[in-house]
Structures are given as structure tokens and as C-alpha cells.
């Protein structure tokens, strides 16, 4: 049964979903505001945002005494999103205030600013690493989702319509769905990953979904009104059952699994696809980009950054 | 935890001013997005204005637009609310909000709030 892991505010936890007594491990606690969260499963860590410290931060899962570390702890000012591109080895992250979507590696090094223009309140963030695509919401003036290359390329609008407070974005890896929940229309809903074929889920009965995640046949949400975890079929939308309630402040939620993060080979693992800094994926070929920190410009030869960096 | 006390309502003529005040304990407000709702009697708590912490964005209702004006002072502690051009339709209980998730506060789940100020438009 899937392992829910799950940002709290104070804490980031972990509750086993289909567990018979459903209660809550503490991953890391002694925390000012996590937000976000996500993992690499093949090396256990986690990684979280805290929206008061505004730092993305990092440990590892079956450690005992495991430290917190600072990935990055400049720069940011409320990162609502982030996801871990476990195939690149990169960060993924979306802040509200600077209006930014950016990019790092694991460790926080080689930061680059992919997205700065038109970006108003984006908020969840989600990876296709198998196609190259990146996905994000925006509950601004003009709601919308978007989708864009990892490395930055071909921005899309896919979803602008029957849409308000986009929270909550989730892709069905297996079946190339997007699922998306919106807080003030209190629906889930899903679609193709280029927007298209629009299906409803759940509607109407929602209270205030934040953060979507699912496994097999199982969406996972949050819920700030309920302060709870709920599930329901991916499909129908039937068989709504309350995973765990009487959270302190439940906000990002994931399914700690490796099929989550299903593993293939790249370009980039292959001495860093020849770039000397970040090795991008792409939907076009060749499935990669190099690319350079913030403020570095790439050298002609289209993979060495030039000197600065 | 921050402790929110609002005050400057009363009574005033339509066409006239107001400046809200909402003062806060607690030496991080900087870091909360801070927001004014307002509850008129019989009607539910509606939205106002928000600044962000670094008050580098401001919200606005369409219905306060061009009239109000909601700015900050970190280092006094205090986010402002003008309030020009008053009608009597915006008589009802202004309410300071803060957050430090500004998702929360822009959607009307805000940790901490005030007891409220009471706003009279009235000739």
C-alpha cells in the first residue's frame, strides 16, 4: 500500500495509506513553515521548502539522526512548488513572490531562472522527465496551467478556462493524464498532457483542496478546511475515504514510491550530456540542453558555460 | 504567533477618509503577507486588499479599487489601510488577517486575525 509523504508546516511526515491504524511518522520535525515536498527515492531523500525561512531544505529517510540540510537559502521569498526531476537530478521550484520558476541541481548548485516573465501566483509544479516537459499552475488575474520544456523551451498555455485556484497538480505517469484540483471551484478535474480531453473527477464536493498526488488507481489530496487527507478513484472519482484527519496544517502532499519515479537512461548521465554545467531534458532532440547558471552565458559551442560560472 | 489589534474606524461622511491601522506583535511580521476583510452586518467576511511581506505586491476587490490604498511599515510593525472616497456600502467591521503562506491569506485561510474596527459611511 502506498506510503504518503506530506508536508505539515511544522513537520514532514509520512502515513501509510492503506496501514490499518492510520497514524503519522514524523520524517523531520522543529520546522517553521514546510510547504512543498518532494523525494528522490533511489537515494531516500526529501526535500521541502519552508515558505517563513525561505530555503529549500534536504535529509534522508532511514538514517537515524539524519541532518537537515540547506540546499538553497538565498534568492527565494515564498516557494509554493517544487519537484525533483529524478531522472536529471535536478530541482524543479516555483516562488510566488519573486514570480520565478528556476531550476538547480540537487545540491542547490548551477541555479538558473528558466521562467520570470508572466508568471503571477504560480503554485504547483509537476515532471515528465520520459517526454522533456515541465507543468505548473498559476492561480493569479488569469488562472491557467501551463507546460513548458524542462531545459525552458516551447511555453505552453494548456488549460485557461473553467479554472480559478489551480492548487493542487498531479501527472498519471502510466497514462499520460494530468490531474489538476481547484480550491474555489472545488473540483478535481484531469485532461491530456497537452490540455485537451477534459474529464471531470470529483466536483462540487470538495472544501479546500491544496496539493494532489496519486498512485495506481488512487488520487491522493489535502484539504486546509478539513485539515485532512483524502482519497478517491482516479477515474470515477467514487470511493472517497478519508486517509488521515486532525493535522496541524497539511500542505504538499507525494507518493513515496519508486513507481513514482520510474527510472530510464539519458543523454545527460552520460558524461553530463558534454555540458559543463547543467544538462537539461527536452522534448525535442536531442532530448537534452545545455545550460548555464543565471547571468553565464553558453559558449558557441552550445555546451561550455563561459568563465564566471 | 502574532497578536493583530486593529484601529482608525468610525464615523464618516460619504465622499470622506479613513486611515486603518493594524499593529502587530511579534518581531517576524515581515515575514507575513497581511490582508483586510471586511464584514458587513448580515453578509460573510469578503476580501479587501493584501500586501505580500515584502510589500512588493499589492490585491485589491474590484469593488476598492482606485479608492483604497493598503501599504506596510516593517519596521513599525504596521500595515495601513486608506480608505478615500467612501461610500455607505462600505460601512461594516474591517478585520487584519496575516499569514506567512501568502497562498493561504490571498485564499481566505489566514492564520491570525484581529477583533476588527467598526467603519460607519453615513451622512
Known amino acids: 500500500s502506498p506510503l504518503l509523504l506530506f508536508a505539515n508546516r511544522r513537520d514532514v511526515r509520512l502515513v501509510d495509506a492503506g496501514g490499518v491504524k492510520l497514524e503519522s511518522t514524523i520524517v523531520v520535525s522543529g520546522l517553521e513553515d514546510a510547504a512543498a515536498v518532494d523525494f528522490q527515492f533511489s537515494k531516500g531523500a526529501v526535500y521541502w521548502t519552508d515558505v517563513s525561512e525561505e530555503a529549500i531544505k534536504q535529509t534522508y529517510l532511514n538514517q537515524t539522526g539524519a541532518a537537515v540540510q540547506n540546499v538553497v537559502i538565498s534568492g527565494l521569498v515564498s516557494p509554493d512548488g517544487l519537484a525533483c526531476d529524478w531522472v536529471g537530478k535536478k530541482l524543479y521550484w516555483t516562488d510566488s513572490e519573486t514570480n520565478r520558476i528556476e531550476v538547480a541541481n540537487l545540491n542547490g548548485t548551477s541555479r538558473k531562472v528558466l521562467f520570470w516573465q508572466d508568471l503571477d501566483q504560480p503554485r504547483a509544479i509537476a515532471l515528465d522527465p520520459a517526454h522533456g516537459y515541465m507543468y505548473w499552475t498559476d492561480w493569479g488575474e488569469t488562472p491557467r496551467i501551463e507546460r513548458a520544456g524542462m531545459d525552458g523551451s516551447t511555453r505552453k498555455i494548456i488549460v485557461d478556462s473553467d479554472i480559478y485556484w489551480p492548487n493542487g497538480l498531479t501527472i498519471d505517469l502510466e497514462e499520460q493524464k494530468l490531474y489538476w484540483a481547484d480550491a474555489k471551484l472545488s473540483f478535481i478535474h484531469r485532461a491530456n498532457l497537452d490540455g485537451s480531453f477534459r474529464q471531470k473527477v470529483v466536483e462540487g464536493s470538495l472544501t479546500h483542496p491544496f496539493a494532489l498526488t496519486l498512485s495506481g488507481d488512487t488520487l491522493y489530496w489535502t484539504d486546509w478546511q478539513t485539515r485532512s487527507i483524502h482519497a478517491c478513484n482516479k477515474r470515477t472519482g467514487g470511493k472517497r475515504k478519508e486517509i488521515l484527519s486532525a493535522l496541524y496544517s497539511p500542505m504538499d502532499i507525494q507518493v513515496l514510491s519508486q513507481e513514482r519515479q520510474p527510472f530510464f537512461h539519458t543523454r545527460c548521465e552520460e558524461d553530463n550530456g558534454g555540458c559543463s554545467h547543467l544538462c537539461l531534458l527536452s522534448p525535442s532532440e536531442p532530448f537534452y540542453t545545455c545550460a548555464c547558471p543565471t547571468g553565464v552565458q553558453l559558449q558557441d559551442n552550445g555546451r561550455t558555460c563561459k568563465a564566471g560560472a | 504567533a502574532v497578536q493583530l489589534v486593529e484601529s482608525g474606524g468610525g464615523l464618516v461622511q460619504p465622499g470622506g477618509s479613513l486611515r486603518l491601522s493594524c499593529a502587530a506583535s511579534?518581531?517576524?511580521?515581515?515575514?507575513?503577507?497581511v490582508g483586510w476583510f471586511r464584514q458587513a452586518p448580515g453578509k460573510e467576511r469578503e476580501f479587501v486588499a493584501a500586501?505580500?511581506?515584502?510589500?512588493?505586491?499589492?490585491y485589491y476587490a474590484d469593488s476598492v479599487k482606485g479608492r483604497f490604498t493598503i501599504s506596510r511599515d516593517n519596521s513599525k510593525n504596521t500595515v495601513y489601510l486608506q480608505m478615500n472616497s467612501l461610500r455607505p456600502e462600505d460601512t461594516a467591521v474591517y478585520y487584519c488577517a496575516a499569514d506567512t503562506r501568502t497562498v493561504a491569506l490571498l485564499q481566505y485561510r489566514y492564520d491570525y486575525w484581529g477583533q476588527g474596527t467598526l467603519v460607519t459611511v453615513s451622512s
Open positions: 500586501i505580500r511581506r515584502r510589500g512588493s505586491s499589492t
Open positions: 511579534g518581531r517576524t511580521f515581515s515575514t507575513y503577507t
